[in-house]
Interface confidence: low
C-alpha cells in the first residue's frame, strides 16, 4: 500500500503536485509499512478496543487563513477518555480522586510506556530496534528525551505526508510560499504503541486556506454608541477604525502597509500608513465604506521577457461580493478564482509584489446624544429640624438627539460601589433641559454618574459631591466633574467622554 | 450572477396595503444596499428609499415617509416595501436595485411591479 | 434636498448625430451622478457612473462629461436602439434624486 490509499479521501491531482511542493515534507506515492502500521478502515471493529476506557479524540486546529508566503501553523491537541491525562514521562495515567464510569480512580497507569520497554528496545542497530520507525521505515529521531514521545502523528495534505514523534500534542508548520491559494485540507492520523507496533487511536481533518488576499478585520467603536455590534454610529462624533490584519506568523512585519480608506459619504479617498483612523460623519443615512490594504511582500520575479510590460499602478478591483463583515468577525476574504502561481525557488530573489487585502462594510448613520453635562447643582432647602436625608437637585444638559431615558447612579467616592440606581423615561424640551432631584443618606462624598440615552446612543458624565454635616453654615461643593476612560482614569473638569 | 427577482402585479382598492418583495441571488445579500424607486406611468423615475440589509437601516425621501416602509428579511435574501393608506396617485411600476461593487448608484434592477390602486 | 433639472425633456435626432443631454444639481456634487437608460416595459439599464466612466457592455459612442452641479451625456453617432429614455441620478447624498428624464425620439 501507498501512503495515499492509507490516508487519503482527498485525492490530489497529479498536475497539482509540481506547484505544491513542501520543503521536508514527501510524496504520498511511498510505500507505507502495513506490518508495523496496520491499517484499519472506518467502521472496523478494533478501533473501539485501540484504546483503554474509551476513544481518544485528536482535534486540529491551524491559523488558517494564510498568505501566500507566509507560514501556517497546525496542532494536534489529544483529548483523553475521561480521567485520563499524560504524566511528565510520557505515559498515560488516572487522574487522582475523579469518577468515571468505572467509579473512583487513584493514581493508577493506564499505558506505562516507558518502564513496559527494556532497555534494549531502545538501543540503535540491533534487530530489537526496528519496530521504532514511522510507516515509510525511516527511523525515528533520537533527540534528548525521545523515549517519552508515545505517539506517532501522520500529516496528510496536497498530495504530501509529514511524520513525528510525540506526545499528548503535536505542531507542524508549513510554508505556503509555492502553493496554490486556496481551500486545501489537513488531515492527521495518530498511532500509539502496541508491543512492536503501532496501532491508530484517532483520526482528524480540518480545512485550511490559502488566500492570495491579505485576510483584514476592522473594528469599529465609537464614543456614546450604544451598540458597538449593530453597524449603527452617531452624525458628528468621531468613528475609531482598527484594522487588524491576521497575520500569525508574521509574514507582513518588514512590510509598508498602506490603507486606502473611502468612507462613501464623498469626503474622497484618505491613504494612511496607520491601522487606525478616526472618521467623523456628518449626515445622517447609509454609507458604504471601502477599505483597500496594500502592501509588498518577497515574491517571484518574473521571467526575464524584453517585452515585460510594467506592473499596473492600480489595485485589482474587488469582486462584486465580498464576504462578511464586521458583524460576523471573519476576515473579508475574497473568491481568488484558485488561480495556480508557478514559483520557482525564490530564497536568492528579491522580488517583490503587491498584495491587497478588502473590507466593506455598509454602516448607518444617526442623530445621538453626542454630550451630556451637569450644568447645575442645588440644595433643596429643607424644613427644620433636618432630615436624615439631604436633597439635590442637579440641572443636566446634553447635545444632539433628545434622550428618551435617564439614570442617575450614586456610588462611592472611586465611582466603583454603586449604592444606588434610578432609571426613568424622560420628557425633555428642545433645549434638553433636564432637572432631577436626588436625596443623598447622610454626609460625605458621593459620585453621581448621569447617563442619557435613546435608542441608538448613550452618553455620560459623572461629577463627585460632598454633602456636608448638619452645621447650617456648611456649604454644599461639587468636588469635580469629571468622566471615564475605559481604564476609569479621571480626566479634567467639564470634559463629557463616554 | 446578480439577480432581483420581483413580486407579481398588483390589484388593490384603495386605502388598503400592498406588501412588494424583492428577492436577491448571485450575492451576499447583507453587503448591498437595496433601492426602491417609482414610475407612474409616461413618467420618470422617483427615488422612494434605501435599506442596508445587513442592519435593517432605512433611508427614505420626505414624501414617503409614513406611506412606504422598508425591511429586509437576511434568511430568504429577499427586502420588501410596504406601501399603506393606497390612493390612486399610487399607481405605479415600482422597482428595487442594487448598487454596482462600490455602491455607485443602480447596477441591477428588478424587473419592475405593476401596482393598480381602483375600486 | 438636492434638486435635478435634465434638459431637454425631450428631442428627436436622425441617425448618426451626436446628440448632447445635461443635467444641472442646485449643488455641487463632485462627480456623483449617474445616468441610466429606459426602454418601454423595461427597468433602467446602467450607463454611465461617477460622471464620465462607462459601465460594463455600454459601446463607447456614449460618453460623460462635468463635475461640480453641470453634467453632460454625449451619443455620438446615434444608432437605432439608442432612442429611448435617459435619467440623471445624484448619489451625492440622502435622498438620491433623479433628472426629470429626456425622451430622445427617432426624427
Known amino acids: 500500500k501507498r501512503f495515499r490509499d492509507v490516508l487519503g479521501h482527498e485525492q490530489y491531482p497529479d498536475h497539482m503536485r509540481e506547484h505544491n511542493q513542501l520543503r521536508g515534507w514527501s510524496s504520498d506515492e511511498n510505500e507505507w509499512d502495513e506490518h508495523l502500521y496496520p491499517v484499519w478502515r472506518r467502521g472496523d471493529g478494533r478501533w473501539k478496543d485501540s484504546w483503554e476506557g474509551g476513544r481518544v479524540q485528536a482535534v486540529l486546529t491551524s491559523d488558517s487563513p494564510a498568505l501566500v508566503g507566509s507560514n501556517i501553523t497546525f496542532v494536534v491537541n489529544l483529548v483523553f477518555p475521561r480521567c485520563q491525562k499524560e504524566d511528565a514521562n510520557g505515559n498515560i495515567v488516572y487522574e487522582k480522586n475523579c469518577r468515571n464510569d468505572l467509579g473512583l480512580t487513584s493514581d493508577l497507569h493506564v499505558y506505562n510506556w516507558t518502564a513496559g520497554a527494556d532497555d534494549g528496545d531502545w538501543e540503535d542497530g540491533t534487530s530489537r530496534s526496528q519496530h521504532l520507525r514511522f510507516p515509510d521505515r525511516r527511523p525515528f529521531p533520537r533527540p534528548h528525551g525521545w523515549k517519552k514521545w508515545s505517539f506517532v502523528y501522520v500529516f496528510h495534505t496536497l498530495g504530501q505526508y509529514f511524520q513525528k514523534l510525540g506526545r499528548c500534542s503535536a505542531r507542524v508548520s508549513i510554508n505556503t510560499v509555492n502553493l496554490t491559494a486556496g481551500p486545501q485540507v489537513m488531515e492527521v492520523t495518530v498511532f500509539r504503541r502496541y508491543g512492536r507496533a503501532y496501532i491508530p487511536i484517532s483520526k482528524v481533518k480540518d480545512v485550511y486556506v490559502i488566500t492570495d488576499q491579505i485576510p483584514v478585520f476592522v473594528t469599529m467603536s465609537q464614543k456614546n454608541d450604544r451598540n458597538l455590534s449593530d453597524e449603527i454610529f452617531l452624525r458628528d462624533l468621531p468613528i475609531v477604525f482598527d484594522v487588524l490584519i491576521h497575520d500569525p506568523s508574521h509574514f507582513l512585519n518588514d512590510s509598508a502597509i498602506s490603507y486606502k480608506w473611502n468612507f462613501g459619504d464623498n469626503t474622497g479617498l484618505f491613504v494612511s500608513n496607520n491601522h487606525t483612523l478616526n472618521h467623523t460623519y456628518v449626515l445622517n443615512g447609509t454609507f458604504n465604506l471601502n477599505l483597500t490594504v496594500q502592501t509588498a511582500v518577497p515574491g517571484p520575479c518574473p521571467p526575464p521577457s524584453p517585452s515585460t510590460p510594467p506592473p499596473p499602478s492600480t489595485p485589482p478591483s474587488p469582486p462584486p461580493s465580498p464576504l462578511p463583515t464586521l458583524s460576523t468577525p471573519s476576515p473579508s476574504l475574497m473568491p481568488t478564482g484558485y488561480k495556480s502561481m508557478e514559483l520557482s525557488d525564490i530564497s536568492n530573489e528579491n522580488c517583490r509584489i503587491n498584495r491587497y487585502g478588502y473590507f466593506r462594510a455598509t454602516i448607518t448613520i444617526v442623530e445621538g446624544i453626542l454630550e451630556v453635562s451637569i450644568m447645575q447643582i442645588a440644595d433643596v432647602p429643607m424644613p427644620t429640624p433636618q432630615p436624615a436625608n439631604s436633597l439635590m437637585d442637579f440641572t443636566v444638559t446634553c447635545k444632539g438627539a433628545t434622550p428618551m431615558e435617564a439614570c442617575t447612579i450614586i456610588s462611592d467616592p472611586t465611582c466603583q460601589i454603586a449604592q444606588n440606581r434610578v432609571c426613568s423615561p424622560v420628557a425633555v424640551d428642545g433645549l434638553c433641559l433636564l432637572s432631577v432631584r436626588r436625596a443623598f443618606n447622610g454626609s460625605g462624598t458621593y459620585c453621581v454618574n448621569f447617563t442619557l440615552g435613546d435608542d441608538a446612543s448613550l452618553a455620560l458624565t459623572s461629577t463627585l459631591i460632598s454633602i456636608p454635616g448638619k452645621d447650617p453654615d456648611s456649604p454644599l461643593r461639587a468636588v469635580n466633574e469629571f468622566d471615564y476612560k475605559d481604564d476609569d482614569d479621571k480626566l479634567e473638569h467639564h470634559h463629557h467622554h463616554h | 450572477q446578480v439577480q432581483l427577482q420581483q413580486s407579481g402585479a398588483e390589484l388593490v382598492r384603495p386605502g388598503t396595503s400592498v406588501k412588494v418583495s424583492c428577492k436577491a441571488s448571485?450575492?451576499?445579500?447583507?453587503?448591498?444596499?437595496i433601492e426602491w424607486v417609482k414610475q407612474r406611468p409616461g413618467q420618470g423615475l422617483e427615488w422612494i428609499g434605501v435599506?442596508?440589509?445587513?442592519?435593517?437601516?432605512?433611508n427614505y425621501i420626505e414624501k414617503f415617509k409614513g406611506k412606504a416602509t422598508l425591511t429586509a428579511d437576511k434568511s430568504s435574501s429577499t427586502a420588501y416595501m410596504q406601501l399603506s393608506s393606497l390612493t390612486s396617485d399610487d399607481s405605479a411600476v415600482y422597482f428595487c436595485?442594487?448598487?454596482?461593487?462600490?455602491?455607485?448608484?443602480?447596477?441591477?434592477w428588478g424587473q419592475g411591479t405593476l401596482v393598480t390602486v381602483s375600486a | 434636498e438636492i434638486q435635478m433639472t435634465q434638459s431637454p425633456s425631450s428631442m428627436s435626432a436622425s441617425l448618426g448625430d451626436r446628440i448632447t443631454i445635461t443635467c444641472q444639481a442646485t449643488?455641487?456634487?463632485?462627480?456623483?451622478l449617474n445616468w441610466y437608460q429606459q426602454k418601454p416595459g423595461k427597468p433602467p439599464s446602467f450607463l454611465i457612473y461617477?460622471?464620465?466612466e462607462l459601465a460594463e457592455g455600454v459601446p463607447s459612442r456614449f460618453s460623460g462629461s462635468g463635475s461640480g452641479s453641470d453634467f453632460s451625456l454625449t451619443i455620438s453617432n446615434l444608432e437605432s436602439e439608442d432612442f429611448a429614455d435617459y435619467y440623471c441620478?445624484?448619489?451625492?447624498?440622502?435622498?438620491?434624486?433623479f433628472g426629470g428624464g429626456t425622451k430622445l425620439e427617432i426624427k
Open positions: 436595485a442594487r448598487g454596482a461593487n462600490w455602491d455607485v448608484g443602480f447596477a441591477y
Open positions: 461617477y460622471a464620465t
Open positions: 448571485g450575492y451576499a445579500f447583507s453587503n448591498h444596499l
Open positions: 435599506i442596508n440589509p445587513g442592519s435593517g437601516g432605512t
Open positions: 441620478l445624484q448619489f451625492h447624498e440622502f435622498p438620491r434624486t
Open positions: 449643488q455641487d456634487i463632485v462627480k456623483n
